[in-house]
Amino acid sequence: EVEKTACPSGKKAREIDESLIFYKKWELEACVDAALLATQMDRVNAIPFTYEQLDVLKHKLDELYPQGYPESVIQHLGYLFLKMSPEDIRKWNVTSLETLKALLEVNKGHEMSPQVATLIDRFVKGRGQLDKDTLDTLTAFYPGYLCSLSPEELSSVPPSSIWAVRPQDLDTCDPRQLDVLYPKARLAFQNMNGSEYFVKIQSFLGGAPTEDLKALSQQNVSMDLATFMKLRTDAVLPLTVAEVQKLLGPHVEGLKAEERHRPVRDWILRQRQDDLDTLGLGLQGGIPNGYLVLDLSMQEALS
């Protein structure tokens, strides 16, 4: 806290300009009017204030706006945004995407801070849903943003927003998140033709059910092994050897290298060894010839 002292003669600030960088903290406190600061916030970021001087400016704004800053001030906070606590930000009402972009720009290249997370949360809640423009902006600054949301939060993403999602945006998503996103992607891309559809839907397939994988196997998609390894185990298990062969196309040879890893390992255990042998890959661990396979889960469902 800067001690309250009278402003020295001739030092009262008439505008926010470069001369203020030579003011000591107590002079800034005494000589800069908070209302003047608020109306000329757009100049602050262009002036090389010290970190400590920015503390004084924040303090002045806090006194002027104890209930939270107006958006006209928020949009021009610049480096001052880094001084804000999540508690400060919870008082704000940010509605403009331009304001959001301006503040994210300040933090660009750094990990998502608690301040940024709070800002995004306030903004999205204010909008009611994660629309395409917002998602576009957020994933541009934070590729992992989508995967930081809970399945419940993801449920508010409209299918139209899925067009903004890039493959790298889904890198850190877990199966529960992909379970929510996949049906939205399927809906968003439903009018595309086969090969184009597969290119778009590929990143979301970690949430695909068995029947969709069976359908894809009929379309010569040539899924790569990296995508196959991210599929839900429960969705892969019911696929036949022929379906997996069609699904992977020339990439089927990659199964050998992955035979000890899920979901390939579990899938192998469910196939007849005879069928696996038809692939000519030397996959071992299938059901020996002559054994009867009882699907107990099906039996339980019938009884």
Epitope: T50, Y51, L82
Partner: nanobody, 117 residues
Framework: QVQLVQSGGGLVHPGGSLRLSCAAS????????MRWYRQAPGKERDLVAL???????YYEDSVKGRFTITRDNPSNKVFLQMNSLKPEDTAVYYC???????????WGQGTQVTVST
């Protein structure tokens, strides 16, 4: 570990010149705003000159036209060229490296500049 090492101070007659140097190790000075402060006996530390990371410079009114702040990014150094020195320029001069993104800032050890007949 970060160090700012200053050199170039000394005793000089009024009207004379001195060049202060500030060499950094452990940080890339090109990413920092660099400042020269001075502190006269019994006085507060005052900002004298500043150069931003994009090379824009600012001067305190009493030194405008006499002092020049420059940076040499390849050698990781900042300089303060002081011409037409006056007795009131007598002080300990400090270089400082700071970024608005962080509360951490670094200081040189200080260099005595004495302007006297």
């Amino acid at each position: 570990q970060v160090q700012l090492v200053q050199s170039g101070g000394g005793l000089v007659h009024p009207g004379g010149s001195l060049r202060l140097s500030c060499a950094a190790s452990g940080i890339d000075l090109s990413l920092y705003r660099m400042r020269w402060y001075r502190q006269a006996p019994g006085k507060e530390r005052d900002l004298v000159a500043l150069i931003t990371d994009d090379g824009t410079s600012y001067y305190e009114d009493s030194v405008k036209g006499r002092f020049t702040i420059t940076r040499d990014n390849p050698s990781n150094k900042v300089f303060l060229q002081m011409n037409s020195l006056k007795p009131e320029d007598t002080a300990v001069y400090y270089c400082n490296a700071e970024t608005p993104l962080s509360p951490v800032n670094y200081w040189g050890q200080g260099t005595q500049v004495t302007v006297s007949t």
